[in-house]
C-alpha cells in the first residue's frame, strides 16, 4: 500500500471513528433496564451520560437531565471526562492530519514536516480511541458490578401495602451506545496506527539526498542548467516538465533538490 493511500485510509478510518465517539457520547442508551410492564402502560427506561429517558408503549418519550440529581458518582464524571477528552483530541488530530495529508499542498511544507504532523495526528487519534475505549469499558464495568440491585421492601406505618416502597426494575443491561463507543474507539485507534505507519513512509531517507558527482578523466564536462534529467533524457515524463526552480513542485518531483544531480 502506498504512503498516500495508507495515510488517506488512516485519516478516513479515524474520521469515522471520531464521528462514532461523538455519537456514543451524545446517545442516551448507555444502559437500559428490562422492560417493565406496568398495568397502565409498558415502560422502557434507559440512561446515558447526561440524562435519563423513559419510553412508553404509546411511543411517548421523556428525557430529563441529571442536573437535578443529588449524587452523581465520580466514576460517571470520569467516563464523561474521558469521552470529552477523546473528542477534543480527535478534533485536534483531524485538524493536524488535514494539513499533514500528502495529497494536500500547503505552501512549501516539506515531507519531513508532513511526516511529523502525520505522526502527531496518529498519536492523537490513538490516544483519542484509547480514551473512548477506556470510558466505555469503565461504564460497562460499573453496570456489571454495581447495577444489579436487589429488590428492597421498606414498610412504614401500617402493614400490608400501606406506605410500601419497592424497586421496580432490578437489572441493567448494556445499551447500544456502549457498542458504538467500543467500535468507534477501535476505529479511531486503528486509523491512528495507520497514520503512524504512513509517517514512516513519508520520512525522507538520507541516502536519497546525497549529492552525486562524476569525474570524467581528461575532459571537462560543462554544467548543464537542466540537470541530469534534461541532459540524458531521463524524467521526460510529460506530466512533470517543471524542473526545480525554487517554486512549486509536483508530487512526483517533491524529492528533487537543487544539489541532487547538478554535476555530471
Amino acid at each position: 500500500m502506498s504512503v498516500t493511500a495508507c495515510q488517506g485510509l488512516g485519516f478516513v478510518v479515524s474520521l469515522i471513528g471520531f464521528a462514532g465517539i461523538i455519537a456514543a457520547t451524545c446517545m442516551d442508551q448507555w444502559s437500559t433496564q428490562d422492560l417493565y410492564n406496568n398495568p397502565v402502560t409498558a415502560v422502557f427506561n434507559y440512561q446515558g451520560l447526561w440524562r435519563s429517558c423513559v419510553r412508553e408503549s404509546s411511543g411517548f418519550t421523556e428525557c430529563r437531565g441529571y442536573f437535578t440529581l443529588l449524587g452523581l458518582p465520580a466514576m460517571l464524571q470520569a467516563v464523561r471526562a474521558l469521552m470529552i477528552v477523546g473528542i477534543v483530541l480527535g478534533v485536534i488530530g483531524i485538524l493536524v492530519s488535514i494539513f499533514a495529508l500528502k495529497c494536500i499542498r500547503i505552501g512549501s511544507m516539506d515531507d519531513s514536516a508532513k511526516a511529523k504532523m502525520t505522526l502527531t495526528s496518529g498519536i492523537l487519534f490513538i490516544i483519542s480511541g484509547i480514551c473512548a475505549i477506556i470510558g466505555v469499558s469503565v461504564f460497562a464495568n460499573m453496570l456489571v458490578t454495581n447495577f444489579w440491585m436487589s429488590t428492597a421492601n421498606m414498610y412504614s406505618g401500617m402493614g400490608g401495602m400501606g406506605g410500601m416502597v419497592q424497586t421496580v426494575q432490578t437489572r441493567y443491561t448494556f445499551g447500544a451506545a456502549l457498542f458504538v463507543g467500543w467500535v468507534a474507539g477501535g476505529l479511531t485507534l486503528i486509523g491512528g496506527v495507520m497514520m503512524c505507519i504512513a509517517c514512516r513512509g513519508l520520512t525522507p531517507d538520507d541516502s536519497n539526498f546525497k549529492a552525486v558527482s562524476y569525474h570524467a578523466s581528461g575532459q571537462n564536462v560543462a554544467y548543464r542548467p537542466g540537470g541530469f534529467k534534461a541532459s540524458t533524457g531521463f524524467g521526460s515524463n510529460t506530466r512533470n516538465k517543471k524542473i526545480y526552480d525554487g517554486g512549486a513542485r509536483t508530487e512526483d518531483d517533491e524529492q528533487s533538490h537543487p544539489t541532487k544531480y547538478d554535476y555530471v
Partner: nanobody, 123 residues
Framework: EVQVVESGGGLVQPGGSLRLSCAAS????????MGWYRQAPGKQRELVAG???????RYADSAKGRFTISRDNAKNTVYLQMNSLKPEDTAVYYC?????????????????WGQGTLVTVSA
C-alpha cells in the same frame, strides 16, 4: 425518602361524588405512572385507574364512564374524580406511583404505595 399521600376519602351516599388526591413528595427525579388501586374487605387489590406521563390512561371495567383520572405533572399529583358511586365501590383506595429517585445514579425506579384512604358508599 419518597412517599405518596392520599386524601379526599370519606363517607358518601350512593350516587354521590368524591375527588381523591394523591401527591408524591421527596427526592423525585421523574414519575412514570401514577394510579389508583382499591382493596375491598376480603378481596384482592385491583387497579381502578392509572395515568402515565405521556397521558396514557387505563380504567377498570367497573370504573369506565364513572371515574376520571387526571394528573398534574408539575405538582407530582394525580386525581381521581369518582361520580355515580355505588355501595360496591366501598374500599380502601391506594395511590401508586412508579417513580425515579433523585438521590443516586443510576436512576432507581421505585414503586411507591400510599397508606390508603377509606371510601365508604352507604345510605
Amino acid at each position: 425518602e419518597v412517599q405518596v399521600v392520599e386524601s379526599g376519602g370519606g363517607l358518601v351516599q350512593p350516587g354521590g361524588s368524591l375527588r381523591l388526591s394523591c401527591a408524591a413528595s421527596g427526592s423525585i427525579f421523574s414519575i412514570n405512572v401514577m394510579g389508583w388501586y382499591r382493596q375491598a374487605p376480603g378481596k384482592q387489590r385491583e387497579l381502578v385507574a392509572g395515568i402515565s406521563t405521556g397521558g396514557t390512561t387505563r380504567y377498570a371495567d367497573s370504573a369506565k364512564g364513572r371515574f376520571t383520572i387526571s394528573r398534574d405533572n408539575a405538582k407530582n399529583t394525580v386525581y381521581l374524580q369518582m361520580n355515580s358511586l355505588k355501595p360496591e365501590d366501598t374500599a380502601v383506595y391506594y395511590c401508586n406511583a412508579d417513580l425515579a429517585t433523585a438521590t443516586s445514579w443510576p436512576v432507581r425506579y421505585l414503586e411507591v404505595w400510599g397508606q390508603g384512604t377509606l371510601v365508604t358508599v352507604s345510605a
